[in-house]
């Protein structure tokens, strides 16, 4: 029954983390204006892995893809490797999961293809979880790097009366939803690890020992007959509740206004 | 059409209070913030501030913190700005102006003159 | 504050004739997120309210006409009308759309011979 539990809620939570890891590739916010050197400005600046924008006090917000590939900053390109790939991973993961749970039942599979699914779902969702996490941790690198450099070239190109502000940049939502997102998925992957030990059917030292009973030769093994009987799994089907998790990108901060392109 | 209409002059002693009014109609009013300016005299603008009808939202211009309220009625679709303690220094034409793009502003009301004499 | 230089304060000049006024902000207007200039010109003729030409320093509004031209980038815009014509006698006014509070420049008045 823990097994099951173990395995039930790693699923969960990395069904959880995988939907947060899209969600945190899809925002626009990974980048936001850093607002303490002007806090008077009436144009907002936001940047995501696939488009910038900008929101205008008016409530107009003009979003701008990046639609060159090869005129971006290769760390951009390698977090966008590292999101997509940890969604692919976790989806796959998750797929195979699916299969692997323990109150699902699919033929006649036995627990040991069973564990070894739930293995490598949970391995998937590690690797899954710790892309994300590198991903995110990239970027944020990028933008504490980045944001000193402009600070210490604050003022240049001040001349005479005129002073030109340089915009800086900080972490954006989607950071924190990829660093939460990532962590889910990892935990969950230790879980559905954790609960694959559990899955796998004992193999114990003992050899079979033959009781002769009068007239009767049976033979007990061991472990016999939870094996052959299936006893303990569930064989309700069990619901999986997935939360939805929704993307707050905030692209429009009017919701009676368009967005134009 | 887009029309802004805004309340008639007003004629106040110093230290009251008046309450200016802007109807707006033929366009979303929560959509677009509506902005507040002041022209004294024929001079130059002063933009006094705006709210975002939306949310309810305000941004003053510090010089005029204090002495101006701005308020909406979402149900008439009805900007307002109310001045308090009024002095001299009050009378002026003030405009309702619609946010735009580029924060511009692209409608604006016909203006209220306000004077205000002992 | 943005303190926003318009000049000439005034001039006159005869119809058909090209006219040019300056604005100048005294911080750059440049947003670098969109590359675009916050910066907004608005005509105002006697007894009106102002009414929008052009925002974003160079994006004329719908309806203006095309002798309207705005142009500049960074602290440094200008107005340009090509072929003046009777109706443009009016107040011309540049306003900071960049930074809070809005502010506007003193204006300048155009008056035909």
């Known amino acids: 029954m823990a097994v099951t539990a173990c395995q039930g809620l790693g699923f969960v939570v990395s069904l959880i983390g995988i939907a947060g890891i899209i969600a945190a590739t899809c925002m626009d916010q990974w980048s936001t204006q850093d607002l303490y050197n002007n806090p008077v400005t009436a144009v907002f600046n936001y940047q995501g892995l696939w488009r910038s924008c900008v929101r205008e006090s008016s409530g107009f917000t003009e979003c701008r893809g990046y639609f060159t590939l090869l005129g971006l900053p290769a760390m951009l390109q390698a977090v966008r490797a590292l999101m997509i790939v940890g969604i692919v991973l976790g989806a796959i993961g998750l797929l195979v999961s699916i299969f692997a749970l323990k109150c699902i039942r699919i033929g006649s599979m036995e627990d040991s293809a069973k564990a070894n699914m739930t293995l490598t779902s949970g391995i998937m969702f590690i690797v899954s979880g710790l892309c994300a996490i590198a991903g995110v941790s990239v970027f944020a690198n990028m933008l504490v790097t980045n944001f000193w450099m402009s600070t210490a070239n604050m003022y240049t190109g001040m001349g005479g009366m005129v002073q030109t502000v340089q915009t800086r940049y900080t972490f954006g939502a989607a950071l924190f939803v990829g660093w939460v997102a990532g962590g889910l998925t990892l935990i969950g992957g230790v879980m559905m690890c954790i609960a694959c030990r559990g899955l796998a059917p004992e193999e114990t030292n003992y050899k079979a020992v033959s009781y002769h009973a009068s007239g009767h030769s049976v033979a007990y093994k061991p472990g016999g007959f939870k094996a052959s009987t299936g006893f303990g799994s569930n064989t309700k089907n069990k619901k999986i509740y997935d939360g939805g998790a929704r993307t707050e990108d905030e692209v429009q901060s009017y919701p009676s206004k368009h967005d134009y392109v | 059409e887009f029309q802004l209409q805004q309340s008639g002059p007003e004629l106040e002693k110093p230290g009251a209070s008046v309450r200016i009014s802007c109807k707006t109609s033929?366009?979303?009013?929560?959509?677009?913030?509506m902005n507040w300016v002041k022209q004294s005299n024929g001079e130059s603008l002063e933009w006094i501030g705006y709210?975002?009808?939306?949310?309810?939202?305000?941004r003053y211009n510090q010089k005029f913190k204090g002495k101006a309220t701005l308020t909406v009625d979402k149900s008439s679709s009805t900007a307002y700005m109310q001045l308090k303690s009024l002095t001299s220094e009050d009378s002026a034409v003030y405009y309702c102006a619609r946010s735009y793009y580029g924060n511009a502003f692209d409608y604006w009301g016909q203006g209220t003159t306000l004077t205000v004499s002992s | 504050d943005i303190v926003m230089t318009q000049s000439p304060s005034s001039l006159t000049v005869t119809a058909g004739e090209k006219v040019t006024m300056s604005c100048k902000s005294s911080?750059?207007?440049?947003?670098?997120?969109?590359?675009?200039?916050?910066l907004t010109w608005y005509q105002q003729k006697p007894g009106q309210p102002p009414k929008l030409l052009i925002y974003w320093a160079s994006t004329r509004e719908s309806g203006v006409p095309d002798r309207f031209t705005g142009s500049g980038s960074g602290t440094d815009f200008t107005l340009t009308i090509s072929s003046v014509q009777a109706e443009d006698l009016a107040v011309y006014y540049c306003q900071n759309d960049y930074s809070y509070p809005f502010t506007f420049g003193s204006g300048t008045k155009l008056e035909i011979k």
């Open positions: 709210i975002d009808p939306y949310y309810g939202g305000t």
């Open positions: 911080q750059s207007l440049l947003n670098s997120g969109n590359q675009k200039n916050y």
């Open positions: 033929g366009y979303s009013f929560t959509g677009y913030n």
